[in-house]
């Protein structure tokens, strides 16, 4: 579990207890057995939005 008092990971990422970091859920595409991928299954990835002038 994430350490108490730390901010939750932003959308599209999930906490890795192994690495002590918020990891991009995109990693789970190739490495689905990483510890944080369980958290990714519950949260859809953040959509990427192009910023037009």
């Amino acid at each position: 579990e994430q350490a108490p008092g730390t901010a939750p990971c932003s959308r599209g990422s999930s906490w890795s207890a192994d690495l002590d970091k918020c990891m991009d859920c995109a990693s789970c595409r190739a490495r689905p057995h990483s510890d944080f991928c369980l958290g990714c299954a519950a949260a859809p990835p953040a959509p990427f939005r192009l910023l037009w002038p």
Partner: antibody
Framework: DVQLQESGPGLVKPSQSLSLTCAVY????????WSWIRQFPGNKLEWMGE???????NSNPSLKSRISITVDTSKNQFFLQLNSVTTEDTATYYC???????????????????WGQGTLVTVSA | DIVMSQSPSSLAVSVGEKVTMSCKSR????????????LTWYQQKPGQSPKLLIY???TRESGVPDRFTGSGSGTDFTLTISSVKAEDLAVYYC?????????FGSGTKLEIK
């Protein structure tokens, strides 16, 4: 600083098994993926497979029936076994760590940032 | 498997010149959810192990001189050395890690005139 060192026999007979060890010194072992890559004479590089400290693996389908990658977290070591070798398996074998980098507080795998020095394995009768 | 093609296979330049080399993937290695290209560039000097130069197509690894620049997206990528030094003599490989099996290009050998 993390350092990796490959070890194993430099000569293997055809049809036998090739077994290599990669020892990881310094840094964290958990959470990272640890890879085996080989470089054939002529310099072509081939990713063979990877493992994490939990024993989860990805392997190159071209080797799937012959390759086994295992880990010993108590010793910070991981291992390669390649069965039924032929002269085509003659290569320099490297172990490497898949690095992790962050952008705006979100981290992701970012390429093999630490490599061993490589060990030449010759398959010959 | 995602096939990676590099060109040219070799090139010879003088110290101080600008160099560009190309890497193309058979299919896109851009992941739309985070807009990252899962492409790395490695430098392998004679007798040494490969060294990570660039990841995510354009991010320099810590300690890599800023004369090395990675660019491109989707299927077409470029490594540029703005002003070549003698120590840049090496083979440069691209690699995709968008999906397994992770695959390498055949390399571009940089020679110094």
């Amino acid at each position: 600083d993390v350092q990796l060192q490959e070890s194993g026999p430099g000569l293997v007979k055809p049809s036998q098994s090739l077994s290599l060890t990669c020892a990881v010194y310094g840094g964290s072992f958990s959470g990272y993926y640890w890879s085996w890559i080989r470089q054939f004479p002529g310099n072509k590089l081939e990713w063979m497979g990877e493992i994490n400290h939990r024993g989860s693996t990805n392997s190159n389908p071209s080797l799937k029936s012959r390759i086994s990658i295992t880990v010993d977290t108590s010793k910070n070591q991981f291992f390669l076994q390649l069965n039924s070798v032929t002269t085509e398996d003659t290569a320099t074998y490297y172990c490497a760590r898949e690095g992790i980098s962050g952008s705006m507080g979100i981290y992701d795998y970012s390429g093999m940032d630490v490599w061993g020095q490589g060990t030449l394995v010759t398959v010959s009768a | 498997d995602i096939v990676m093609s590099q060109s040219p296979s070799s090139l010879a330049v003088s110290v101080g010149e600008k160099v560009t080399m190309s890497c193309k993937s058979r299919q896109s290695i851009l992941y739309s959810s985070n807009n990252k290209n899962y492409l790395t560039w490695y430098q392998q000097k004679p007798g040494q192990s490969p060294k990570l130069l660039i990841y995510w197509a354009s991010t320099r690894e810590s300690g890599v001189p800023d004369r090395f620049t990675g660019s491109g997206s989707g299927t077409d990528f470029t490594l540029t050395i703005s002003s070549v030094k003698a120590e840049d003599l090496a083979v440069y490989y691209c690699q995709q890690y968008y999906s397994t099996p992770y695959t390498f290009g055949s390399g571009t050998k940089l020679e110094i005139k």
